[in-house]
């Protein structure tokens, strides 16, 4: 029952999604909000935190297949840790291999999400739109 | 409290969204599903109907501002009525002025939705991906 259903099946049940902050998008019990006010990565992160959320974490192509459809570039919660060279999410977990195609657009320690599971490396101080996420599962 | 919040406010309440068919997107109590199997307009319409839904109806830029972010082109439930020259939705309602920018890409009586509230006229028999919608409010 993916977002991109190859075969159409009549759903057996209808269900509620959430809970999410009012007027956020709910998909597979995760909450998403897109903000079109451009902020640097740190201010974007702070904005999400102020709403008990975090910047977008990509953890599953299946559970987050709605992200295939997102146009433009938006800050996500991925940061480069210079001490060990790894890319890490805000929750401290390491980026799983094969989840994102990382593209070095600029020198930087932060990453923009772009459609079809691409991550563009960017300078953290550059203003961009951003995606906040709240996991409820 | 739009999808594109200009000012960040801590939500006073969290709430559930829906009900929707399992694994559909829920936003402002409407349900959306994107299908990447290409079908002509009539088959797309039938697919949505088989799931107690209809092809996408654009009725409010505010309530449907998530559609700003959608990349690519997808069938929506807008058809041209040659007898009176109007564009109407599956439910019989007429397209409200200023909701969509209609662009004549091809000669046709059906329309594709494209990001930022654009509608591209297309031949109804051409296969395309499509968006189903279920209104719960």
């Amino acid at each position: 029952n993916s977002l991109f259903n190859q075969e159409v099946q009549i759903p057996l049940t209808e269900s509620y999604c959430g809970p999410c902050p009012k007027n956020w998008i709910c998909y597979k019990n995760n909450c998403y909000q897109f903000f079109n006010e451009s902020k640097n990565w740190y201010e974007s992160q702070a904005s999400c935190m102020s709403q008990n959320a975090s910047l977008l974490k990509v953890y599953s192509k299946e559970d987050q297949d709605l992200l295939k459809l997102v146009k433009s570039y938006h800050w996500m919660g991925l940061v480069h840790i210079p001490t060990n060279g790894s890319w890490q999410w805000e929750d401290g977990s390491i980026l799983s291999p094969n989840l994102l195609t990382i593209i070095e657009m600029q020198k930087g320690d932060c990453a923009l999400y772009a459609s079809s599971f691409k991550g563009y490396i960017e300078n953290c101080s550059i203003p961009n739109t951003y995606i906040c996420m709240q996991r409820t599962v | 409290n739009s999808l594109f919040n200009q000012e960040v406010q801590i939500p006073l309440t969290e709430s559930y969204c829906g009900p929707c068919p399992k694994n559909w997107i829920c936003y402002k109590n409407n349900c959306y599903q994107f299908f990447n199997e290409s079908k002509n307009w009539y088959e797309s319409q039938a697919s949505c109907m088989s799931q107690n839904a209809s092809l996408l109806k654009v009725y409010s830029k505010e309530d449907q501002d998530l559609l700003k972010l959608v990349k690519s082109y997808h069938w929506m439930g807008l058809v041209h009525i040659p007898t009176n020259g109007s564009w109407q939705w599956e439910d019989g309602s007429i397209l409200s002025p200023n909701l969509l920018t209609i662009i004549e890409m091809q000669k046709g009586d059906c329309a594709l939705y494209a990001s930022s509230f654009k509608g591209y006229i297309e031949n109804c028999s051409i296969p395309n991906t499509y968006i189903c919608m279920q209104r719960t409010v």
Epitope: E43, Q45, A46, S47, Q88, E90, G92 | V8
Partner: antibody
Framework: EQSGGGAGGGLVKPGGSLELCCKA?????????MSWVRQSPGKGLEWIGR?????????AYASWVNGRFTLSRDIDQSTGCLQLNSLTAADTAMYYC?????????????WGQGTLVTVSS | DIQMTQSPSSVSASVGDRVTITCRAS??????LVWYQQKPGKAPELLMY???TLQSGVPSRFSGSGSGTDFTLTISSLQPEDFATYYC?????????FGQGTKVEIK
């Protein structure tokens, strides 16, 4: 590194007020949050609240604070303060200013040395 | 508020012993879990974040695991400097909350 554990601690009477301040150094104050955590004698750790070091005014408090405590910050001075009002004996504790690192699971990765606040008549 | 419950509240062990401390959250917190070490008269120090990522400079004898509601801190071979009190903390949502602490004492 964070220097200073909070100036202004000491003995205060019940119902009294006190302001604790903490100056951060050695890192960019504007990209972190300052939090305050307290520890009563022989007890565990209790989170009080957090304030963003950047230009946006984001704060959050523990529900038990109930408006008695207020966080503030001076970005130019890289300083954060905690105003304590309507103090009771139950507020007697060591008060720590801490750096909240939002990229490391919202952990408190640097701690001031702490300021002991004693509420007693 | 999310409650964090640690067990045991204290443990007596000898140098070289393997020590395990558990922390349970009252609701799922994914991997937003942090561990601290506190020695008497000192401020706590960050040990681990993300449930299993060691803070820079922390010895590899410390390890962490878990996700969701159940988490574990393990010291594989206890050293004299490891005798301290250990706290877990959730960073998933405000108010941030700590476990009540586990004191590791010399047997």
């Amino acid at each position: 590194e964070q220097s200073g554990g909070g100036a202004g601690g000491g003995l205060v009477k019940p119902g009294g007020s006190l302001e604790l301040c903490c100056k951060a150094s050695g890192f960019d104050f504007s990209i972190y949050w300052m939090s305050w955590v307290r520890q009563s004698p022989g007890k565990g750790l209790e989170w009080i609240g957090r304030i963003y070091g950047g230009s946006s005014d984001y704060t959050a408090y523990a529900s038990w604070v109930n408006g008695r405590f207020t966080l503030s910050r001076d970005i130019d001075q890289s300083t954060g303060c905690l105003q304590l009002n309507s103090l009771t004996a139950a507020d007697t504790a060591m008060y720590y200013c801490v750096r909240l690192n939002p990229s490391f699971s919202r952990s408190f990765d640097y701690w001031g040395q702490g300021t002991l606040v004693t509420v007693s008549s | 508020d999310i409650q964090m419950t640690q067990s045991p509240s204290s443990v007596s062990a000898s140098v070289g012993d393997r020590v395990t401390i558990t922390c349970r959250a009252s609701q799922g917190i994914f991997s937003w879990l942090v561990w601290y070490q506190q020695k008497p008269g000192k401020a706590p120090e960050l040990l681990m974040y993300g449930a299993s990522t060691l803070q820079s400079g922390v010895p590899s004898r410390f390890s962490g695991s878990g996700s969701g509601t159940d988490f574990t801190l393990t010291i594989s071979s206890l050293q004299p400097e490891d005798f301290a009190t250990y706290y877990c903390q959730q960073g998933y949502s405000t108010p941030y909350t700590f476990g009540q602490g586990t004191k590791v004492e010399i047997k």
